[in-house]
């Protein structure tokens, strides 16, 4: 008799999830000498332990503590790049500007990037059929709680000038419901962080508007200012040129506005 299984609204666990996490861990620790001491089998065991046999709508930050402990990593606190709804460009940027870090450039972020996972209450099975959707099912699901936990820690780690890349093509350039808007903004430490600098990335080639005047950016400025952190904003009119100039800052065309 087939066992009844809860049907969730979201996609199921990414196929080959255990193998993917383990392989990513091995690759990361090979590339980053400061993380060579990490035992990837223990990392996988801790990851698995956070959600296996637990109801996928009842996950807590405490469930991830063993994994967080194994994934302890010091990041240069003044070289942190946050992003919202523009992950690919943010990652392209840190691949060129190697001294800056997004969350996905850390071990924990790298392990989980673009993956989905969940288990089932009282069984050791991974659910490959469906997982809870944040909106339609529940917010305390394994994926959402993981990203909330690591994002909070990442924001708490930041100091001096923190940069955030925002998508100027979206109707809400700053979205209070994004991970950046709901978690990271509120966990920047005013005693450590002097300035949040927003980079608003333009989508259209001929778009010369000053998106730093957008009402949602003004809302972000208000939230940040109330937290005693300075705010500044820059338009990145040509993201392609922006990346090119990060690669080749001496290029003569890089002195003009990008």
């Amino acid at each position: 008799v087939p066992r009844w299984r809860q049907q969730w609204s979201g996609p199921g666990t990414t196929k080959r999830f255990p193998e993917t996490v383990l392989a990513r861990c091995v690759k990361y620790t090979e590339i980053h000498p400061e993380m060579r001491h990490v035992d990837c089998q223990s990392v996988w065991d801790a990851f698995k332990g956070a959600f296996i046999s637990k109801h996928p709508c009842n996950i807590t930050e405490e469930d991830y503590q063993p994994l967080m402990k194994l994934g302890t990593q010091t990041v240069p606190c003044n070289k942190i790049l946050l992003w919202s709804r523009i992950k690919d460009l943010a990652h392209q940027f840190t691949q060129v500007q190697r001294d800056m870090f997004t969350l996905e450039d850390t071990l924990l972020g790298y392990l989980a990037d673009d993956l989905t996972w969940c288990g089932e209450f009282n069984t050791s099975k991974i659910n490959y059929q469906s997982c809870p959707d944040w909106r339609k099912d529940c917010s305390n699901n394994p994926v959402s709680v993981f990203w909330k936990t690591v994002s909070r820690r990442f924001a708490e780690a930041a100091c001096d000038v923190v940069h955030v890349m925002l998508n100027g093509s979206r109707s809400k350039i700053f979205d209070k419901n994004s991970t950046f808007g709901s978690v990271e903004v509120h966990n920047l430490q005013p005693e450590k962080v002097q300035t949040l600098e927003a980079w608003v990335i333009h989508g259209g080639r001929e778009d010369s508007r000053d998106l730093c005047q957008d009402p949602t950016i003004k809302e972000l400025e208000s939230i940040i200012s109330k937290r005693n952190i300075q705010f500044s904003c820059k338009n990145i009119y040509r993201p392609d040129k922006f990346l090119q100039c990060v690669k080749n800052p001496e290029d003569s065309s890089c002195t003009s506005e990008i």
């Epitope: 967080m68 994934g71 990593q73 820690r153 780690a157």
Partner: nanobody
């Protein structure tokens, strides 16, 4: 509940060495759960991170102070200390010891726990 308490002289002469100790209670200084550091706040200025020491024993120092700073741990006394050499009037500040949870991505600047602070004046 972790508690930190700074101790040391309130007055140091220019060119001498500033030495402060931080006593940790409510937790073990040798626990892998924490990392430790020093920060300071000169009069009328922002807090400034001085340096940190990690579970592994490795240290990280503010580049602007690196040549003058040493942070070390004494596990037998459950305390850690700061030495800052060749001080000048610019080193006058309230000095704080701090502790941070050692999990996930962490910055060099621990900010989960902090002592009350001790004012150190550099003057002859």
């Amino acid at each position: 509940q972790l508690q930190l308490q700074e101790s040391g002289p309130g007055l140091v002469k220019p060119s001498e060495t500033l030495a402060l100790t931080c006593n940790v209670s409510g937790g073990s200084i040798s626990s892998s759960s924490y990392y430790w550091g020093w920060i300071r706040q000169p009069p009328g200025k922002r807090l400034e991170w001085i340096g940190s020491i990690y579970y592994s024993g490795s240290t990280d120092y503010n580049p602007s102070l690196k040549s003058r700073v040493t942070i070390s741990v004494d596990t037998s006394k459950n305390q850690f200390s700061l030495k800052l050499t060749s001080v000048t009037a610019a080193d006058t500040a309230v000095y704080y010891c701090a502790g941070g949870y050692n999990y996930g991505p962490v910055g060099q600047w621990p900010s989960d726990y902090r002592g009350q602070g001790t004012l150190v004046t550099v003057s002859s």
